[in-house]
């Protein structure tokens, strides 16, 4: 079998809401993945599991099942959304994200994603980790090329 390539492209959008009373930030983060099938047969994307970390704390998890089938030598772009909550011991971030004196409220999040593919009864898992800047102060839609530049895509050290 040839390789199945997973490329994390970046954050597509981040939608934010707040609970002032609880000093809580809710961020719905939509990410984009490219999955390339370099084989001469179809592969099934069984599931995608994702989690988001802020300051080494997991703030959101998501799992997508039975996603799609990728044909021979084909590529598919998949969007997935991770709902995240920044609260409790990180509630000081409410002050940062709602600060009126600054325009862009970028925070650094670690995006982790694992793609499980299947072909001929065989399963394969491919994982990626990237740090991303996300604006927690407003709803933001990123151009993907811009997102790669903005989000300083680098593997975890």
């Amino acid at each position: 079998p040839r390789s199945i390539e997973v490329k994390y492209i970046g954050v597509k959008s981040a939608y934010v809401s707040y609970d002032a009373e609880k000093r809580t930030i809710y961020l719905n983060i939509t990410n984009t993945l490219n999955i390339t099938n370099n084989n001469y047969y179809s592969v099934e994307v069984e599931n995608i599991t994702a989690q988001v970390q802020f300051s080494k704390t997991v703030i959101g998890k998501a799992r997508l099942n039975n996603i799609t089938n990728i044909g021979p030598l084909d590529m598919k772009q998949i969007d997935y959304t991770v709902p995240t909550v920044i609260a409790e011991e990180m509630s000081y971030m409410y002050d940062f994200c709602t600060l009126l004196s600054i325009k862009v409220h970028n925070i650094v999040l670690m995006m982790q994603v694992t793609v499980t593919t299947a072909y001929f009864g065989h399963s394969e898992q491919i994982s990626q980790e990237r740090y991303q800047y996300v604006d927690c102060g407003r709803n933001t839609t990123y151009q993907l090329a811009q997102s790669e530049y903005l989000n300083v895509l680098q593997p975890q050290q």
Epitope: E88, E89, Y92, D95, F96, N106, V108, Y131, Q157
Partner: antibody, heavy 117, light 107 residues
Framework: QVQLQQSGAELVKPGASVKMSCKAS????????IEWMKQSHGKGLEWIGN????????KYNEKFKGKATLTVDKSSSTVYLDLSRLTSDDSAVYYC??????????WGQGTSVTVSS | DIQMTQSPASLSVSVGETVTITCRAS??????LGWYQQKQGESPQLLVF???NLADGVPSRFSGSGSGTQYSLKINSLQSEDFGTYYC?????????FGGGTRLEIK
């Protein structure tokens, strides 16, 4: 307004211990971590450790493990720094500060510790 | 531990001039950087947080920039009250560390 009030100067003998305080006011005490720094005379700043009153999470710089201990009295919104087995190298000004994302936004006035026989 | 290399160590500048102080991190700190001013006998004061954001009450002649491992603090049209020592500090991974400081003297 936010204030961090530190205890007064200390003159202590080598081998002894000292406990200094940092009393927070003007904000919800449990929301922000409190950081501690050391500044030796005419020198730069060193981070000692931090304490988060929300969950009592304490982190230390390896260099100060066994030397520094952070404790809290939540009823008075006060964080304490205890320094043990003092030597002349511990003579310095010790600052507490409030953590904010990407910087420490409020600082105490500092506590001067002099170790001398 | 992440090392913060600050330069220059000292400089002497006339009122009205522009000054830039730089800080280099030994690895990517993702804009988790603060700049502080400290005057003789006083506590440090936050000038810039998260690399680019001006703290409350800080004059607009101060500005922070940079990303990755390279950061700078710029002071436009230097005033006499700007003398003192400036420190950068990363807050990316524990232990937080400070730069060695830049002593700014007014000519």
């Amino acid at each position: 307004q936010v204030q961090l009030q530190q205890s007064g100067a200390e003159l202590v003998k080598p081998g002894a211990s000292v406990k200094m305080s940092c009393k927070a006011s003007g904000y919800t005490f449990t929301t922000f971590p409190i950081e501690w720094m050391k500044q030796s005379h005419g020198k730069g700043l060193e981070w000692i450790g931090n304490f988060h009153p929300y969950n009592d999470d304490t982190k230390y710089n390896e260099k100060f493990k066994g030397k520094a201990t952070l404790t809290v009295d939540k009823s008075s919104s006060t964080v304490y720094l205890d320094l043990s087995r003092l030597t002349s190298d511990d003579s310095a000004v010790y600052y507490c500060a409030r953590y904010f994302y990407g910087g420490m936004d409020y600082w105490g006035q500092g506590t001067s510790v002099t170790v001398s026989s | 531990d992440i090392q913060m290399t600050q330069s220059p160590a000292s400089l002497s500048v006339s009122v009205g001039e522009t000054v830039t102080i730089t800080c280099r991190a030994s690895e990517n700190i993702y804009s988790s950087l603060g700049w502080y001013q400290q005057k003789q006998g006083e506590s440090p004061q936050l000038l810039v947080f998260a690399a680019t954001n001006l703290a409350d009450g800080v004059p607009s002649r101060f500005s922070g920039s940079g990303s990755g491992t390279q950061y700078s603090l710029k002071i436009n049209s230097l005033q006499s009250e700007d003398f003192g020592t400036y420190y950068c500090q990363h807050l990316w991974s524990i232990p937080w560390t400070f730069g060695g400081g830049t002593r700014l003297e007014i000519k």
